[in-house]
């Protein structure tokens, strides 16, 4: 998996989207987890509703929300009131039994200021951005 970089500004909200094949992952719940080290496990942050048919309902854990458009095939994670310690490597996962498939690897970056963005123009909005090297950056 390539890594997609999402950049947000401290104190603001950041929305992360994870597209997937809706047919392949039909009936599967989804989760958002944080990779705590090179070899460590992916620590679950939040998962979609226990009833797959209700996956569209937003579920919160602290300042992190998850909602799943199961027909369109888009998992959306919202990080509210973004803080520096929210930065890190995450995964969108599709769950089946005790197994989990990685839908997307996501690197969340929290900037002190919108103008800290590497390629900042006159205006910069948080989210998804340009590709470079093996990463895909979103803003």
């Amino acid at each position: 998996h390539n890594t997609t970089v999402f950049q947000g500004v401290a104190g603001q909200s950041l929305q992360v989207s994870c597209p997937y094949d809706s047919m392949k992952h039909w009936g599967r719940r989804k989760a958002w987890c944080r990779q705590l080290g090179e070899k460590g496990p992916c620590q679950r942050v939040v998962s979609t509703h226990n009833l797959w048919l209700l996956s569209f309902l937003r579920r919160w854990n602290g300042s992190t929300a998850i909602t799943d458009d199961t027909l369109g095939g888009t998992l959306t994670i919202t990080l509210r009131n973004l803080q520096p310690h929210d930065a890190g490597l995450y995964q969108c996962q599709s769950l089946h039994g005790s197994e989990a498939d990685t839908l997307r690897k996501v690197l969340v970056e929290v900037l002190a200021d919108p103008l800290d963005h590497r390629d900042a123009g006159d205006l910069w909005f948080p989210g998804e951005s340009e590709s470079f090297e093996d990463a895909h950056v979103e803003h």
């Epitope: 803080q83 520096p84 310690h85 930065a87 890190g88 490597l89 002190a112």
Partner: antibody, heavy 121, light 107 residues
Framework: EVQLQESGPVLVKPGASVKMSCKAS????????MNWVKQSHGKSLEWIGV????????SYNQKFKGKATLTVDKSSSTAYMELNSLTSEDSAVYYC??????????????WGQGTLVTVSA | DIQMTQSPSSLSASLGERVSLTCRAS??????LSWLQQKPDGTIKRLIY???TLDSGVPKRFSGSRSGSDYSLTISSLESEDFADYYC?????????FGGGTKLEIK
């Protein structure tokens, strides 16, 4: 073993610029944030800013914006900080400090030995 | 910016004595605090992170705790190598800020 080797002491003239380095070893350089910290003689520590070596994204303490520029060279696993328009106020020891995995969510576990910068005519 | 008020600024104590240093945060930092030790040669070492988690290799006589916005570092029984400068660091929000430091000296 994680090591951060900083460049040696420098004596520079007011108005000049200086670029110091922090060579990392013992870990995957691009996986960990790198912070820079200032300590003026006999004073406390001040956070200057942080760089994500993987993307090059930076965040600065507003106080040091325009004064410090953080960069990395991934091929040599080296982080750099350039200070410009130097004055006597910039005379200090500067430390690089490694963060945690793609973040600073556990603070700064590893520190360099510091680079002494003296600004004098 | 979050102010970290560290006390005392200096402390004289004897070998074997129990000492506590405190940092008070001006805003909520939710336990995102670490304690650092700086030796006279300038070497800096992290002792504690997440307010109370001891770094590997750090002697168990060091401990960290939290009470509301007050964070403490306690050394249960001072040893000669503990005489140094100590700083707290909050990494909850930008800009990260340090306490003013405590100089721990031998009485």
């Amino acid at each position: 073993e994680v090591q951060l080797q900083e460049s040696g002491p420098v004596l520079v003239k007011p108005g000049a610029s200086v670029k110091m380095s922090c060579k990392a070893s013992g870990y995957t350089f691009t996986d960990y944030y790198m912070n820079w910290v200032k300590q003026s003689h006999g004073k406390s520590l001040e956070w200057i800013g942080v760089i994500n070596p993987y993307t090059g994204a930076t965040s600065y303490n507003q106080k040091f914006k325009g004064k410090a520029t953080l960069t990395v060279d991934k091929s040599s696993s080296t982080a750099y900080m350039e200070l410009n328009s130097l004055t006597s106020e910039d005379s200090a020891v500067y430390y690089c400090a490694r963060g945690t995995y793609y973040s600073n969510y556990e603070g700064f576990p590893y520190w360099g030995q510091g680079t002494l910068v003296t600004v004098s005519a | 910016d979050i102010q970290m008020t560290q006390s005392p600024s200096s402390l004289s104590a004897s070998l074997g004595e129990r000492v506590s240093l405190t940092c008070r945060a001006s805003q909520e930092i939710s336990g995102y605090l670490s304690w650092l030790q700086q030796k006279p040669d300038g070497t800096i070492k992290r002792l504690i992170y997440a307010a109370s988690t001891l770094d590997s290799g750090v002697p168990k006589r060091f401990s960290g705790s939290r009470s509301g916005s007050d964070y403490s570092l306690t050394i249960s029984s001072l040893e000669s190598e503990d005489f140094a400068d100590y700083y707290c660091l909050q990494y909850a929000s930008y800009p990260y800020t340090f306490g003013g430091g405590t100089k721990l000296e031998i009485k």
